[in-house]
Interface confidence: medium
């Protein structure tokens, strides 16, 4: 859920802390570990029993501007014969990430932290069966 | 940097790229509300490549606790509920951005940090290496 209204700040404030206006935070967007790379097993998106495709979304007013989204290729899962088994379900694994949103209000610019939901990949699950009374 | 489209009527002093340091509102906006599927917490158990969640805590980071997925088995669960070692459970990893207090202990000064997390597991056909 959304982090709500600004209230009482209670930290023991070291003298070296930068001054910050009330209700806001100073954010350095030079990312720590910027060059770290994901070392996932090779092309798991194609080898998975719940395979997926990737699409890249681009928004110049967002930092980072590029966010990659996965989409499950099938409703069912791929069996040992390479056929879709609809008795099982391919489901998206979703995760939030933080981004910085740049907003233009007239000629002034403001920045907002935002949580964005990203689909990371898919997994194969046994379906939940609802029995009708 | 990232180029930003700008209102052509505004003074030209503004940088087109994101500045290195910005002041942001303490409220974190949630774009997901009512538009996306809600968190589904039981896939970890129902998956053919099930996983457990393990805790990693750092009080100078937001979020302070990160739960990492660890695949329960090397193989995948077959239709009989047994582990099939002809298939592999592998983690799905993703980079997320977190907030790191910088300088440490300062209440409202942060830096973005990229962290690699395992979010869940998926079942894949193994890569078979044939020895010559």
């Amino acid at each position: 859920r959304k982090i709500p209204k600004v209230g009482h700040t209670f930290f023991q404030k070291p003298e070296s802390c930068p001054p910050v206006p009330g209700g806001s935070m100073k954010l350095d967007i030079g990312i720590i570990n910027e060059n770290q790379r994901v070392s996932m097993s090779r092309n798991i998106e194609s080898r998975s029993t719940s395979p997926w495709n990737y699409t890249v979304t681009w928004d110049p007013n967002r930092y980072p501007s590029e966010v990659v989204q996965a989409q499950c290729r099938n409703l069912g899962c791929i069996n040992a014969q390479g056929k879709e088994d609809i008795s099982m379900n391919s489901v998206p694994i979703q995760q939030e990430t933080l981004v910085v949103r740049r907003k233009h209000q007239g000629c002034s610019v403001s920045f907002q932290l935002e949580k964005v939901l990203v689909t990371v990949g898919c997994t194969c699950v046994t379906p939940v069966i609802h029995h009708v009374q | 940097g990232i180029t930003i489209p700008r209102n052509p009527g505004c003074p030209n002093s503004e940088d087109k790229n994101f500045p290195r340091t910005v002041m942001v509102n303490l409220n974190i906006h949630n774009r997901n509300t009512n538009t996306n599927p809600k968190r589904s917490s039981d896939y970890y158990n129902r998956s053919t490549s099930p996983w457990n969640l393990h805790r990693n805590e750092d009080p100078e980071r937001y979020p302070s606790v990160i739960w990492e997925a660890k695949c329960r088995h090397l193989g995948c669960i077959n239709a009989d509920g047994n582990v099939d070692y002809h298939m592999n459970s592998v983690p799905i990893q993703q980079e997320i951005l977190v907030l790191r207090r910088e300088p440490p202990h300062c209440p409202n000064s942060f830096r973005l940090e990229k962290i690699l997390v395992s979010v869940g597991c998926t079942c894949v056909t193994p890569i078979v290496h044939h020895v010559a």
Partner: antibody
Framework: EVQLVQSGAEVKKPGESVKISCKAS????????ISWVRQAPGQGLEWMGG????????DYAQKFQGRVTITADESTTTAYMELSGLTSDDTAVYYC???????????????????WGQGTTVTVSS | EIVLTQSPDFQSVTPKEKVTITCRAS??????LHWYQQKPDQSPKLLIK???HSISGVPSRFSGSGSGTDFTLTINGLEAEDAATYYC?????????FGQGTKVDIK
């Protein structure tokens, strides 16, 4: 294991204020928030508001807005809840509860109450 | 605000019996639903988080299921020490809200 220890019982007159403390030990105080939940005699649980320690921000249930103030002091790892303008309807047991600040199962915030104080009985009577 | 309605309000059960308590939300809350146990003159205790996640130290006879608007807490093989009031709690939307409670006693 996080432990939350609350201040003792209070007897107040209508119109007065009460301030209850909740001292946390074990775990990092910054790694979670504290919510306040009350329970009137023979009734269910009612959330009043909470503080998210990491950003030092608060939010309150509409019903208590303007009457409740939640604060925290990191140096003593203690959270406080002050309720003003007391009436007999505020007679209840008041609990503090820990709210984890987690990235859990792919999401940034979790909001279960995984540890509770022992409760503070507040009696409002003229 | 989101209203949680539990049923039944009261249940009298024989030891070793299976107990099922349901909680219905007035709108979709995904799996942001938690269950607590409260014994007389004690604080509530977390039993299940996020609809189905078990909590370490809680006996395995307690389990949870459901998503969206309909949730269930199941006690498989009730024991005498399980006599308590059980509450569901949603954290999807502020304000946090609780069900009215289900009192379980032993026959």
């Amino acid at each position: 294991e996080v432990q939350l220890v609350q201040s003792g019982a209070e007897v107040k007159k209508p119109g007065e204020s009460v301030k209850i403390s909740c001292k946390a030990s074990g775990g990092s105080f910054r790694s979670y928030g504290i919510s306040w939940v009350r329970q009137a005699p023979g009734q269910g649980l009612e959330w009043m508001g909470g503080i998210t320690h990491f950003f030092g921000i608060t939010d309150y249930a509409q019903k208590f807005q303007g009457r409740v103030t939640i604060t925290a002091d990191e140096s003593t790892t203690t959270a406080y809840m002050e309720l003003s303008g007391l009436t007999s309807d505020d007679t209840a047991v008041y609990y503090c509860a820990r709210e984890p600040n987690d990235f859990w199962n792919g999401y940034y915030d979790t909001h279960d109450f995984d540890s509770w104080g022992q409760g503070t009985t507040v009696t409002v009577s003229s | 605000e989101i209203v949680l309605t539990q049923s039944p309000d009261f249940q009298s059960v024989t030891p070793k019996e299976k107990v099922t308590i349901t909680c219905r939300a007035s709108q979709n809350i995904g799996s942001e639903l938690h269950w607590y146990q409260q014994k007389p003159d004690q604080s509530p205790k977390l039993l299940i988080k996020y609809a189905s996640h078990s909590i370490s130290g809680v006996p395995s006879r307690f389990s949870g299921s459901g998503s969206g608007t309909d949730f269930t807490l199941t006690i498989n093989g009730l024991e005498a020490e399980d006599a308590a009031t059980y509450y569901c709690h949603q954290s999807d939307t502020l304000p946090h809200t609780f069900g009215q409670g289900t009192k379980v006693d032993i026959k």
